[in-house]
């Protein structure tokens, strides 16, 4: 911590501009003033400040606002963020949006930190629920970051918000993580037609109950083997060896390739031989 | 050990515009500020401006504002000035120079590079 | 910006002599660095916060002053101390450096 010393004549600074990169951290403590910074906060991140420079300009914010940093100055924090520590986050009240993207962008590029995890679990427990428009914004940060929530959490996602979801924002979804999701994107996209409807919940398909397998079988989708692989154990093995052919249509020829591989290794031990070699794809049950 | 590797002499010509690198290496290239410095002939020093390796953000010298550039790449550690529409005022060698801990000057120089503008 | 005047320009000084030289500053400045060039290589820190020695400076180097003027000393002349010596401010933007003063060997 810089000591307290008096700022020497003629070094308070009127205003936070580039002049402040050539003081010493002592000076920036004595002659910085804080409710000055708070104001000015926007200006520091296009002026090249050391680390040590801004570990002191941190300090004084944490001296003017013991209880946590008002939205305006959160706002406006910059490369300032990745000063802060978790514990100074859950002291922040942050309702914007707009601030949430702000200090987004100064963590692009890199993975979630401790602080970005704190930042966003405080936005959305304010927000009460992870909307579409919150949605947008994290998963466009971090096409990762709906899979990073428990089953708990996923449950809060309104089915509205299901628009915003890409497939690749599935990718490192597991089952139980699905099983929420599932049901959420089946209601959202309930109005759309079969082959719309098929290419919106695509991704989502390894939360699928047999049932709903069952009905899109009967519908000419073509499903690909990357998605069939991604279902439900327990979804697939009832299925007929007929409802998995109009499930995968000229697909079905895939099972082949991936005949030791769950779950076409355990649905081909419950089907009846015969009815396997209807495909004539040499499969052993 | 601390070194700040800099690129070989240029002839450029007038107009034109020149782009000098500096290598860091034996310290945390991210941690320090880097400076570029003008030394004409013989003469004397001057500050060309200053650029934060992490964050990217640059202050020049009013005089040297516009025409010379300050960026870095943080994967090769490399830090780089450019010089546009260059006269025969420009002919000089140019340093790189760490900033010291806490404003402590600049602690490390580069070897220098010899830029001649001559048509 | 602040203008750093040096003197003398050039000087000598023989082996085992005391050398003084200053720096001028047109406004006060919190603190002044010397470097130490010479010829044909780059400039070292030589002093620092106006009276600090750079790593490797030998203990015969000694750096005061305060405001407006500071000034370099050698308590005894080595041949090994014949370059430029330079003075700059980093108090404030931009920074500067003085012309230089010339230490050769008598």
């Known amino acids: 911590e810089v000591e307290k010393t008096a700022c020497p004549s003629g070094k308070k600074a009127p205003e936070i501009d580039e002049s402040l990169i050539f003081y010493k951290k002592w000076e920036l403590e004595a002659c910085v003033d804080a409710a000055l910074l708070a104001t000015q906060m926007d200006r520091v991140n296009a002026i090249p400040f050391t680390y040590e420079q801004l570990d002191v300009l941190k300090h004084k914010l944490d001296e003017l606002y013991p209880q946590g940093y008002p939205e305006s100055v959160i706002q406006h924090l910059g490369y300032l963020f990745l000063k802060m520590s978790p514990e100074d986050i859950r002291k922040w009240n942050v309702t914007s949006l707009e601030t949430l993207k702000a200090l987004l962008e100064v963590n692009k590029g890199h993975e979630m930190s401790p602080q970005v995890a704190t930042l966003i679990d405080r936005f959305v427990k304010g927000r009460g629920q992870l909307d579409k428009d919150t949605l947008d914004t994290l998963t466009a940060f971090y096409p990762g970051y709906l899979c990073s929530l428990s089953p708990e959490e996923l449950s809060s996602v309104p089915p509205s918000s299901i628009w915003a979801v890409r497939p690749q924002d599935l990718d490192t979804c597991d089952p139980r993580q699905l099983d929420v999701l599932y049901p959420k994107a089946r209601l959202a996209f309930q109005n759309m037609n079969g082959s719309e409807y098929f290419v919106k919940i695509q991704s989502f398909l390894g939360g699928a109950p047999t049932e709903d397998l069952k009905a899109l079988s009967q519908q000419n989708v073509s499903m690909d083997l990357a998605t069939f692989m991604k279902l439900r154990t327990d979804a697939v093995l009832p299925l007929t060896v007929a409802e998995v052919q109009k499930l995968l249509g000229p697909h079905v020829e895939g099972l082949k390739a991936e005949e030791r591989h769950r779950p076409v290794r355990d649905w081909i031990l419950r089907q009846r031989q015969d009815d396997l070699d209807t495909l004539g794809l040499g499969l052993q049950g | 050990e601390f070194q700040l590797q800099q690129s070989g002499p240029e002839l450029v010509k007038p107009g034109a515009s020149v782009k000098i690198s500096c290598k860091a290496s034996g310290y945390s290239f991210t941690d320090y500020n880097m400076n570029w410095v003008k030394q004409s002939n013989g003469k004397s020093l001057e500050w060309i401006g200053i650029?934060?390796?992490?964050?990217?953000?640059?202050s020049y010298n009013q005089k040297f504002k516009g025409r010379a550039t300050l960026t870095v790449d943080q994967s090769s550690s490399t830090a780089y000035v450019q010089l546009n529409s260059l006269t025969s005022e420009d002919s000089a060698v140019y340093y790189c120079?760490?900033?010291?801990?806490?404003?402590?000057?600049?602690?490390?120089w580069g070897q220098g590079t010899s830029v001649t503008v001559s048509s | 910006q602040i203008v750093l005047t040096q003197s003398p320009a050039i000087m000598s000084a023989s082996p085992g002599e005391k050398v003084t030289m200053t720096c001028s500053a047109s406004s006060s400045v919190s603190y002044m660095h010397w470097y130490q060039q010479k010829s044909g290589t780059s400039p070292k820190r030589w002093i620092y916060d106006t009276s600090k020695l750079a790593s490797g400076v030998p203990a015969r180097f000694s750096g005061s002053g305060s405001g407006t003027s500071y000034s370099l000393t050698i308590s005894s002349m080595e041949a090994e101390d014949a370059a430029t010596y330079y003075c700059?401010?980093?108090?404030?933007?931009?920074?500067?450096f003085g012309a230089g003063t010339k230490l050769e060997l008598k």
């Open positions: 650029i934060n390796p992490n964050y990217g953000t640059t």
């Open positions: 120079a760490r900033g010291g801990y806490d404003n402590e000057a600049m602690d490390y």
């Open positions: 700059q401010q980093w108090s404030s933007n931009p920074p500067t």
